[in-house]
Amino acid sequence: GITIPRNPGCPNSEDKNFPRTVMVNLNIHNRNTNTNPKRSSDYYNRSTSPWNLHRNEDPERYPSVIWEAKCRHLGCINADGNVDYHMNSVPIQQEILVLRREPPHCPNSFRLEKILVSVGCTCVTPIVHHVA
Amino acid sequence: GITIPRNPGCPNSEDKNFPRTVMVNLNIHNRNTNTNPKRSSDYYNRSTSPWNLHRNEDPERYPSVIWEAKCRHLGCINADGNVDYHMNSVPIQQEILVLRREPPHCPNSFRLEKILVSVGCTCVTPIVHHVA
């Protein structure tokens, strides 16, 4: 890994105990300044592997609301607008970090948690497995 | 929002100053126990809108490594394996939370940051705009 020289102005919150606890400022900085408003707002409907978005809410998590994609069909939409079962709609998944209140119901104490979310769907050629 | 009764065993780190600072345990809990190892490992190659994955590394960020998808083609791959330009490959983007070292180079002090990442690509019907 890369060794970063420590800034002498850092808060003195070094704790030798494992697990490691850090201070996090929750005033979110949004780096998406050059975001194209057209970006992916309606891809879920226009895709050959369309999906629906389901709201997943958990007050013990930060962010409390996460949207989960569920592919609408097993197959993909062909040029005629019909479902073609020679191809498959599959979810594209990503591991993301969230904060989980720990101990539960605490407003100022969290633990990092890794969760797998489905972001959207893509159309793939299925792998054929020959079984006995 | 949902009001959560406060746990009396919470750390007493309530600070009335804005921006709000919280304690976060970096010992990550992984909830992806039932993850299928086949899940999306090779979708980037098998998709009709295939993509390449680019490594984005930033030692001032946690996680320091993020993988960005870039669609390989403007069009989508048809049944013959050729690029079909009647359709378009587009990136599926998601806003995720990361931790940014603040002040810089501090091992134990972070600020939440929202960034936009491309997770994969999907094939869409392009919207036709008639221009003068």
Epitope: K38 | C71, L74, N88, V90, P126, I127
Partner: nanobody, 116 residues
Framework: QVQLVESGGGLVKAGGSLRLSCVVS????????MGWYRQAPGKQRELVAL????????HYSDSVKGRFSISRDNAKNTMYLQMNSLNPDDTAVYYC?????????MAQGTQVTVSS
């Protein structure tokens, strides 16, 4: 906002040649392509030729392969379609298009008529 200005259509005899031009302005996408669609009366719109911005890859419909040639001058933001060995089946309105991911910008069209 993408703007497209096309020119070069007209009337030509079978076996003759024409060159269409199209200037694009106002686009920013690094991944894009320019090309030509055409639509003959009573027929579906057809993608004739296309050239990508990044690699300069070209694509032609089977009906024009070997006769039409698409090229671009990046310095002038201009794309050309050289049409040779024209025949009456090539008679149509030709539309210059600029394609960026998920969006196809289409000009008003220029008429090409091939007489026998």
């Amino acid at each position: 906002q993408v703007q497209l200005v096309e020119s070069g259509g007209g009337l030509v005899k079978a076996g003759g040649s024409l060159r269409l031009s199209c200037v694009v302005s106002g686009h920013t996408s690094e991944i894009s392509a320019m090309g030509w669609y055409r639509q003959a009366p009573g027929k579906q719109r057809e993608l004739v030729a296309l050239i990508t911005s990044r690699s300069g890859d070209t694509h032609y419909s089977d009906s024009v392969k070997g006769r039409f040639s698409i090229s671009r001058d990046n310095a002038k933001n201009t794309m050309y379609l050289q049409m040779n060995s024209l025949n009456p089946d090539d008679t149509a309105v030709y539309y210059c298009v600029h394609n960026e991911p998920g969006h196809l910008y289409m000009a008003q069209g220029t008429q090409v008529t091939v007489s026998s």
